[in-house]
Interface confidence: medium
């Protein structure tokens, strides 16, 4: 396969609700009609797949119904949102992009986005 450059932010801080968003941008060498985006999580040298979606250019990304990811695409950019994150989910989230069709097949893997998740402090008891 042929290599392709993928860019993503180095660091993202998840919101207090456990939501993190980042942009994954790929340098498309051709006119791909079918693109697959996969989010991988690397922690303690273990790599696991968080979510994946295949989309046709010009259409929305469609993740599985039970996926913790949502996303939108615009040209060679994919806006990814990961939900339901907790402190234990802190880690390096890698964006992998594959230009599936038409040939040639291209594969690009980003350097990863370090997502920091801080669990919110529990609310103090109210006097009311």
């Amino acid at each position: 396969c042929k290599a392709m450059h993928v860019a993503q932010p180095a660091v993202v801080l998840a919101s207090s609700r456990g939501i993190a968003s980042f942009v994954c941008e790929y340098a498309s060498p051709g006119k791909a009609t079918e693109v697959r985006v996969t989010v991988l999580r690397q922690a303690d040298s273990q790599v696991t797949e968080v979510c994946a979606a295949t989309y046709m250019m010009g259409n929305e990304l469609t993740f599985l119904d039970d996926s913790i990811c949502t996303g939108t695409s615009s040209g060679n950019q994919v806006n990814l949102t990961i939900q339901g994150l907790r402190a234990m989910d802190t880690g390096l989230y890698i964006c992998k992009v594959e230009l599936m069709y038409p040939p040639p097949y291209y594969l690009g893997i980003g350097n990863g986005t370090q997502i920091y998740v801080i669990d919110p402090e529990p609310c103090p008891d109210s006097d009311f």
Epitope: C1, T33, M100, P103, P104
Partner: antibody
Framework: QVQLVESGGGVVQPGRSLRLSCAAS????????MSWVRQAPGKGLEWVAE????????YHSDTVTGRFTISRDNSKNTLYLQMSSLRAEDTAVYYC???????????WGQGTLVTVSS | DIQMTQSPSSLSASVGDRVTITCRTS??????LNWYQQKPGKAPKLLIY???RLHSGVPSRFSGSGSGTDYTLTISSLQPEDFATYYC?????????FGGGTKVEIK
Amino acid sequence: QVQLVESGGGVVQPGRSLRLSCAASGFTFSNYAMSWVRQAPGKGLEWVAEISYSGTYSYHSDTVTGRFTISRDNSKNTLYLQMSSLRAEDTAVYYCTRRDYDNEMDYWGQGTLVTVSS
Amino acid sequence: DIQMTQSPSSLSASVGDRVTITCRTSQVITNYLNWYQQKPGKAPKLLIYYTSRLHSGVPSRFSGSGSGTDYTLTISSLQPEDFATYYCQQFGKRPPTFGGGTKVEIK
């Protein structure tokens, strides 16, 4: 040189199953996507299925989805097509093809004939 | 699916003739078009890919051109071994689809 050799064809009754194999040599099999294409007697060419180089992704034509499954074993340099619920209209020569980095189907096997008849 | 209309479906020509086969697609395919040659009882062979690029080992008398939805295969000087059936195929969008074929026969 690139060589693709299909096997497993034959005469089978409607509703039955058959598995085709394609032995690849002369290139690094695990680096290439592979496809099956068929040709009914006296007719044109029809794409059947494709599988990615690693086997992670597969695609099937609407006419065979749910009945045929493409798979591969990179350790054996072999491509497969599992065919079930066969119909008379599946009668054809089945070709194994390699998908090059830059285009579709640059090399083809000699084909194996599948005849579905009672 | 993208429909492929190939014409003519058959033609008769003599050795040395210039032969042109056309392929029209139902959608723009941005040059993602191949041409194959098939002889009776044999597997198809790739002749031209990406509209105009000659596959390795294919004689230079074969050439391809076109854009958008209209594509052409030309054999500049027909040779005895060129009598065969020719198919166009698009791979711009899944599923890849083939034209109905053009049979080139001896006049």
